[in-house]
Amino acid sequence: SITGISPITESLASLSTYNDQSITFALEDESYEIYVEDLKKDKKKDKVLLSYYESQHPSSESGDGVDGKMLMVTLSPTKDFWLQANNKEHSVELHKCEKPLPDQAFFVLHNRSFNCVSFECKTDPGVFIGVKDNHLALIKVDYSENLGSENILFKLSE
C-alpha cells in the first residue's frame, strides 16, 4: 500500500531515452499524444512533474510482514494529465484524472544505474515502460535475461 496520499517529494525533469531521444507530449484533437523523437538543438525539452511516493512492500521473509519500501512515481507532463499503463493494450497513455489517482498511474522507480531509471507498472510487476517503434509501450521484462535492456532505460535531467 502507498503510505500517505501526499508525495514525499516532487521534481520537474525532462525525460529522454537511453539513446538520448526526447519524450515529448503534443495536444492533438483534444487528447495528448506521446512521442519519442530526436529534438532539434534549439527546441526546448518537455518537462514532466514526477511525484514520489513511498510504498510498503509486504514479505513473508521478515517478521513484521514488511520487507522494505519501494519508491513509486507518477508522471504528469501537464496539469491534470498523468501517464497511465494500459495493460490490455500494452500501451502507455495520457489521461486526465482527478486524485486519488488510479493504480495504473503509479510506477515503481528502478535505478538501473546512477543516472538511468526504469518505470515498472504497479499493476503488473515485471512490465515496464519502454520504447517500441518510436512510441512508449509496456514491455514485459524477463528478470533473468533483460534487466539491462536499453529500451526500458530512461534518463531524467532537471
Partner: antibody, heavy 122, light 107 residues
C-alpha cells in the same frame, strides 16, 4: 531484523591487498543497492563504493577508483570490497550499508554494519 | 563534486534547549539529503531522509527542513542521549558527499 556483519579487516602493509566481506540477513538482498562507507579515526564519513541491485553497475570516488572493487554474491547475500595497493590514508573503519528503498538510491542509508577496522601501516 | 559545508563544527547545549545544525551545499540539488547521528564508538544512525522525513523509530523531537542549497536539522528539547556527532549527506549526485560533522555536547 535487518543485519549487516562486516569481516576481513586487520593490519596490513602499504601496497598490499585486503578483501572485506559483509554478510546480510533479514531482507531480500538482491533488491537493494549496497554501499561501503569509511571513517578514518577521529574523522568524518567518506563514501567509498556503491553497487546496483542487479550488480551491473559500480561507482567509486576518485580516491579509490582503480584500486578498490565492490562486488556482490546474491546467492550468499554477501557484499565484498576488494582493496588493492593499500595506502596509509586508507586506514579507517569500513561500514557496509543498505539503501532505503528497493531498486533505488534515494533516501540515505538506514542500515549500517558494526564496521571493520583496516589499518595500513609498515 | 557537491561540497557539503556543515556548521557549527561543535555545539554545547543545555538539556531541554532547542538546537539547530545547518548544511550548505556548493550547488543546488533535489531533496535527497539525509542526516545521521553517531554516538561514540557506534555506527551512524539515519535520523532524517528526503530532507524532512523522519526515519522509523527516531524521536519526533528531531526534524529536518530545507531545499536547494540550504538544509537544517533541529532538535527540539535536547536530551542526554542526543550527545553525539551529526552528519549531513547528499545523495543526488555522485560522488556522494557528507558534511564534516557537528559535535553536540551537553552543557
Amino acid at each position: 531484523e535487518v543485519q549487516l556483519v562486516e569481516s576481513g579487516g586487520g593490519l596490513v602493509q602499504p601496497g598490499t591487498s585486503l578483501k572485506l566481506s559483509c554478510l546480510a540477513s533479514g531482507f531480500t538482498f538482491n533488491n537493494y543497492w549496497m554501499t561501503w562507507i569509511r571513517q578514518a579515526p577521529g574523522k568524518g564519513l567518506e563514501w567509498i563504493a556503491s553497487i546496483t541491485y542487479t550488480g551491473g553497475g559500480t561507482y567509486y570516488p576518485d580516491s579509490v577508483k582503480g584500486r578498490f572493487t565492490i562486488s556482490r554474491d546474491d546467492a550468499k547475500s554477501t557484499l565484498y570490497l576488494q582493496m588493492n595497493s593499500l595506502r596509509s590514508e586508507d586506514t579507517a573503519t569500513y561500514y557496509c550499508t543498505r539503501a532505503n528503498y528497493y531498486y533505488n538510491t534515494y533516501g540515505g542509508f538506514p542500515y549500517w554494519g558494526q564496521g571493520t577496522l583496516v589499518t595500513v601501516s609498515s | 563534486d557537491i561540497q557539503m559545508t556543515q556548521s557549527p563544527a561543535s555545539l554545547s547545549a543545555s538539556l531541554g534547549e532547542t538546537v539547530s545544525i545547518e548544511c550548505l551545499a556548493s550547488e543546488g540539488f533535489s531533496n535527497d539529503l539525509a542526516w545521521y547521528q553517531q554516538k561514540s564508538g557506534k555506527s551512524p544512525q539515519l535520523l532524517i531522509y528526503a530532507a524532512s522525513r523522519l526515519q522509523d523509530g527516531v524521536p519526533s523531537r528531531f526534524s529536518g527542513s530545507g531545499s536547494g542549497t540550504r538544509f537544517s536539522l533541529k532538535i527540539s528539547g535536547m536530551q542526554p542521549e542526543d550527545e553525539a556527532d551529526y552528519f549531513c549527506q547528499q545523495g543526488s549526485k555522485y560522488p556522494l558527499t557528507f558534511g564534516s560533522g557537528t559535535k553536540l555536547e551537553i552543557k
